[in-house]
């Protein structure tokens, strides 16, 4: 499956243009912004999604302590450069020739520099901590029910094997989902934890990337789980390189 054959749409990415011009008249979909062909049977890479988002018309719109090397995406949106596989290029630059290095989820991991800045390799983000605060409920959720439902969600909606959901922590009202995926663990065809986390983040914010599907309706044993705050921490296989100035 590359796309829904019947009406030629991309179930996993609504930010695409699809037409039956693939081999044998098959439906083929291309991401907005980059024009790259996407596989609609799986999640589209975050880089292509960010690029598409920047090209689209603008609308008004027992807990883990993150390590000292954890990154938070403070820079927000930018128009990224993606490689031919749809991954982030290690070096990103803006229109004013300001450049910086990013990790595999596109988050800046160095100070900003000029065009002479070198980023030798794309450093993999192997550990993502999704920190959620849910709205008040009658009582706390059952931890094992919550764990099971979130694992099911990541498997069925985001196609992430549960072996990459390292843990689900819960101390009402805080939920933490730990995603882990080393380079050696990730087989061909496995969804990247960075892409799954991005789809989840957009779902939680009510900005679903899925084509023609209802928004995310998260329930634990029938009880709605409504998220009022999300924070995502990214840990790379190699710690980031920031000057001391940034850390003070």
């Amino acid at each position: 499956h590359t796309a829904a054959q019947d009406n030629c749409t991309c179930p996993t990415n609504k930010m695409t243009v699809c037409s039956p011009d693939g081999p044998g008249g098959r439906c083929q979909c291309r991401a907005l912004g980059s024009g790259m062909a996407v596989d609609c049977s799986t999640l589209t890479s975050k880089c292509l999604l960010l690029k598409a988002r920047m090209s689209a018309p603008k609308n008004a719109r027992t807990l883990v302590r993150p390590s000292e090397h954890a990154l938070v995406d403070n820079d927000g949106l930018y128009d990224p450069d993606c490689d031919p596989e749809g991954r982030f290029k290690a070096r990103q630059c803006n229109q004013t020739s300001v450049c910086w290095c990013v990790n595999s989820v596109g988050v800046r991991r160095t100070d900003k520099g000029d065009l002479s800045l070198r980023c030798d390799e794309l450093v993999r983000t192997h550990h993502i901590l999704i920190d959620l605060r849910h709205r008040p409920t009658a009582g706390a959720f059952n931890h094992s029910d919550l764990d099971a439902e979130l694992r099911r969600l990541f498997r069925e909606r985001y196609r992430l094997h549960p072996k990459f959901v390292a843990a689900v922590h819960y101390e009402q009202p805080t939920i933490q989902i730990e995603l882990r995926q080393n380079t050696s663990q990730k087989a061909a065809g496995d969804v990247d934890i960075g892409d799954a986390a991005y789809y989840f983040e957009r779902d939680i914010k009510g900005e679903s990337l899925f084509q023609g599907r209802g928004g995310l309706d998260l329930r634990v044993r029938g009880e709605p789980l409504q998220v009022e705050r999300t924070l995502i921490y990214y840990l790379d296989e190699i710690p980031p390189k920031f000057s001391m100035k940034r850390l003070t």
């Epitope: 179930p11 099971a148 498997r155 069925e156 196609r159 072996k163 990459f164 390292a166 843990a167």
Partner: antibody
Framework: QVQLVQSGAEVKKPGASVKVSCKAS????????INWVRQAPGQGLEWMGV????????SYNQKFKGRVTMTTDTSTSTAYMELRSLRSDDTAVYYC????????????WGQGTMVTVSS | EIVLTQSPATLSLSPGERATLSCRVS??????????MHWYQQKPGQAPRLLIY???NLESGIPARFSGSGSGTDFTLTISSLEPEDFAVYYC?????????FGGGTKVEIK
């Protein structure tokens, strides 16, 4: 309560195809993928593949690739498994089984469909 | 593919006795402390029934005399005191890696 009800026994000739159905009830069909497992007489269990009821696409055991097709009909909450080019060693009980919540365990099983391949 | 080896092939015991079934895996099915190993019971003419998931978690509705242990490549299913209805075939299964595979089974029979 969750139930998976399969179609009845089949007798097929070598080279023919068989299509087994698995009707789900008692839960939201598109929330859980469906696996297919077979068991030859007196033998162990063999996983054939899994179909996403949410997306409609399947992942097959390499052993059956090219001969098996798994599909779903969300309007009737039914999963199907078609096996082509049948041989005598395909004689087995075929089970559908639902993924459990968190760890890809199979928490509910159909009652099984006996498929006999004989000339 | 991951190969699961169960032993013994047959276990002859009397009701009330303790049963210990072993499952050895060709490579680790542990991911960050989560073991993708499950146990099923099958009686003649019936579909398998999930007993234990994630190596040691008791499935809802399964009696507490069943327990699972182990991690990585060595796993055990224990039935603390055999009841007449426990005489059946038991299978271990890994869901760490596609293709998912089952052990050859251990038959627990009445002595």
């Amino acid at each position: 309560q969750v139930q998976l009800v399969q179609s009845g026994a089949e007798v097929k000739k070598p080279g023919a195809s068989v299509k087994v159905s698995c009707k789900a009830s008692g839960y939201t069909f598109t929330d859980y993928s469906i696996n297919w497992v077979r068991q030859a007489p007196g033998q162990g269990l063999e996983w054939m593949g899994v179909i996403s009821t949410y997306y409609g696409d399947a992942s097959y055991n390499q052993k059956f690739k090219g001969r098996v097709t798994m599909t779903t009909d969300t309007s009737t909450s039914t999963a199907y498994m078609e096996l082509r080019s049948l041989r005598s060693d395909d004689t087995a009980v075929y089970y559908c089984a639902r993924y459990g919540d968190g760890y890809n365990q199979f928490d509910y099983w159909g009652q099984g469909t006996m498929v006999t391949v004989s000339s | 593919e991951i190969v699961l080896t169960q032993s013994p092939a047959t276990l002859s015991l009397s009701p009330g006795e303790r049963a210990t079934l072993s499952c050895r895996v060709s490579e680790s099915v542990d991911s960050y402390g989560n073991n993708f190993m499950h146990w099923y019971q099958q009686k003649p003419g019936q579909a398998p029934r999930l007993l234990i998931y994630r190596a040691s978690n008791l499935e809802s509705g399964i009696p507490a005399r069943f327990s699972g242990s182990g991690s990585g490549t060595d796993f055990t299913l224990t039935i603390s005191s055999l009841e007449p209805e426990d005489f059946a075939v038991y299978y271990c299964q890994q869901s760490y890696e596609d293709p998912y595979t089952f052990g050859g089974g251990t038959k627990v029979e009445i002595k």
